[in-house]
């Protein structure tokens, strides 16, 4: 007996083929032996089976012998062994139909967890493997479970059904609602303006919602709400701002707030919560400041850097165009009655400069 | 055992519609198609059409453009609506269940029948 | 529409008689044939179906035969209760159709 894998919501052609190509008598059966469809003359008819509506045949193919059935969208209960009757001789098909349905929304928060589940008809036994965007692969029975979306789990799953070595292919298309980024950060000199950008990973047409960013400055015991917004259909509406720093947010998406200024009583990090219409939990991106200052007073030279740095970042002070520098994995650095010229303060991590500072030491007469 | 009671007026105006609602109870609506069969005074049996439970129906060619059946799982009910009505609508008409099973399909369960008379 | 034909449309017999039905579908509709039985003011009752299969808890004395277009119900011994009409019908294709009835009198 042949065996036909069918997908839920699809299109199924069961074959039946004549010895003879030629226009003959043929019906097709479910197990119950309830005709579904045949020929009368030259006119298909229909019987009284569940799949009266559903069910229909190649006219244009019964001439050369083919008297296929094809149903239309597939339900999980027309699983069945179908029985094709064509010149006294039976044929039978046992249809398989599968369903593989994502348990909740398809539009899912970074963090949250996927539950695919398998529909199938009783008494078979499958196996299901499934790949991520990203490559990652799952296997599973009835149910597959991925305990903690990743961004780039985003995009079209792909899952394979297999039972009696054949096997039936599934696309599903999963939204991770994240950030682009879990976290920034934001290297500016004390007095320069700063871009705080918060771009989403993903689409959808009506975004509704309400954000908070929250702020703990480095100088301060602390935290405190900086600004709330809300969102609605992709606009931006600041609902709450503090006086200080007074922060102004783009009205379009990307999320975009900019700061006047950079100083050091701002430098920290914040966390920027997004809480989304009709879903649970929110999405969350962590943005840092560092901002640099370069002072002279009297006979010293100064470098400084405020907020959340590495370790491993460098602090350089360091006389142009001749070899004379201080470098330091610190968050200061100075130099002692430095020479006339042009001195640059850098903020490096592995030689790349993530921030510099130029200051002017004139002669003292 | 499941029973079936038909309800609705009695009398229809001629050109007006015929509205019929039948009551399944002591069983389930669910994975059943259920029929409308009607038999004018002394005369034989006419299929009128069926409906699944999914909503999807088969309607008798001859009465085809005057009918619409609709089914409501959560009342356990099922409906028959006939339109632009005349004498010849005149009838007892029956609610039933079809069934299948190995080798047979038909009707197992009927209403009691109701009698609807066109007359102005 | 598959067209029965039922013959006769009525007839008499008495207490004990072999009774016979005849239904001709206007094309071949294999074994798919019902019989029910109405009793006057009562909706119809399922006796026979594949044409020749008893259903579960009707007499024995009640019987059908045939295949393609040619059918016989029989009651072997007519009873006082089975006064009633009696209708073919076919389920090879829709819409599902009846013949006109047979009504079965006793003398």
């Known amino acids: 007996k042949k065996v036909v894998l069918g997908k839920k919501g699809d299109t199924v052609e069961l074959t039946c083929n004549a010895s003879q190509k030629k226009n003959t008598q043929f019906h097709w059966k479910n197990s119950n032996q309830i005709k579904i469809l045949g020929i009368q003359g030259l006119f298909l008819t229909k019987g009284p089976s569940k799949l009266s509506d559903r069910a229909d045949s190649r006219k244009s193919l019964w001439d050369q012998g083919c008297f296929s059935m094809i149903i239309k969208n597939l339900k999980i209960e027309d699983s069945d062994t179908y029985i094709c009757e064509v010149e006294n001789k039976k044929e039978e098909v046992e249809l398989l139909v599968f369903g593989l349905t994502a348990n909740s929304d398809t539009h899912l928060l970074e963090g949250q967890s996927l539950t695919l589940t398998l529909e199938s008809p009783p008494g078979s036994s499958p196996s299901v493997k499934c790949r991520s965007p990203g490559g990652k692969n799952i296997q599973g029975g009835r149910t597959i479970s991925v305990p903690q979306l990743e961004r780039q789990d985003s995009g079209t799953w792909t899952c394979t059904v297999s039972q009696d070595q054949k096997t039936v292919e599934f696309k599903i298309d999963i939204v991770v609602l994240a950030f682009q980024k879990a976290s920034s950060t934001v290297y500016k000199k004390e007095g320069e303006q700063v871009e705080f950008s918060f771009p989403l990973a993903f689409t959808l047409e009506k975004l509704t919602g309400s954000g908070e960013l929250w702020w703990q400055a480095e100088r301060a015991s602390s935290s405190k709400s900086w600004i709330t917004f809300d969102l609605k259909n992709k606009e931006v509406s600041v609902k709450r701002v503090t006086q200080d720093p007074k922060l102004q947010m783009g009205k379009k998406l990307p999320l975009h707030l900019t700061l006047p200024q950079a100083l050091p009583q701002y430098a920290g990090s914040g966390n920027l919560t997004l809480a989304l219409e009709a879903k649970t939990g929110k999405l969350h991106q962590e943005v840092n400041l560092v901002v640099m200052r370069a002072t002279q007073f009297q006979e010293n030279l100064t470098c400084e850097v405020w907020g959340p740095t590495s370790p491993k970042l460098t602090l350089s002070l360091k006389l142009e165009n001749k070899g004379a520098t201080v470098s330091k994995q610190a968050k200061a650095v100075w130099v002692l009655n430095p020479e006339a010229g042009m001195w640059q303060c850098l903020l490096s991590d592995s030689g790349q400069v993530l921030l510099e500072s130029n200051i002017k030491v004139v002669p003292t007469w | 055992q499941v029973q079936l009671q038909e309800s609705g007026p009695g009398l229809v105006k001629p050109s007006e519609t015929l509205s019929l609602t039948c009551t399944v109870s002591?069983?389930?609506?669910?994975?059943?198609?259920w029929s409308w069969i009607r038999q004018p005074a002394g005369k034989g049996l006419e299929w009128i059409g069926r409906?699944?439970?999914?909503?999807?129906?088969n309607y008798n060619p001859s009465l085809k453009s005057r009918i619409t059946m609709s089914v409501d799982t959560s009342k356990n009910q099922f409906s028959l609506e006939l339109s632009s009505v005349t004498a010849a609508d005149t009838a007892v008409y029956y609610c039933?269940?079809?069934?299948?099973?190995?080798?047979?399909?038909?009707?197992?369960?009927w209403g009691q029948g109701t009698t609807v008379t066109v007359s102005s | 529409d598959i067209q029965m034909t039922q013959s006769p449309s009525s007839l008499s017999a008495s207490v004990g008689d072999r009774v016979t039905i005849t239904c001709q579908a206007s094309?071949?509709?294999?074994?798919?044939l019902n019989w029910y039985q109405q009793k006057p003011g009562k909706a119809p009752k399922l006796l026979i179906y594949?044409?020749?299969n008893l259903e579960t808890g009707v007499p024995s004395r009640f019987s059908g035969s045939g295949s393609g277009t040619d059918f016989t119900f029989t009651i072997s011994s007519l009873q006082p209760e089975d006064i009633a009409t009696y209708y073919c019908?076919?389920?090879?294709?829709?819409?599902?159709?009846f013949g006109g009835g047979t009504k079965v009198e006793i003398k």
């Open positions: 039933a269940r079809e069934l299948e099973r190995y080798y047979f399909y038909g009707v197992d369960v």
């Open positions: 002591n069983g389930s609506i669910s994975d059943y198609y």
């Open positions: 409906i699944y439970t999914s909503g999807s129906t």
């Open positions: 094309q071949d509709i294999s074994n798919y």
């Open positions: 594949a044409a020749s």
């Open positions: 019908q076919q389920y090879d294709s829709l819409p599902l159709t």
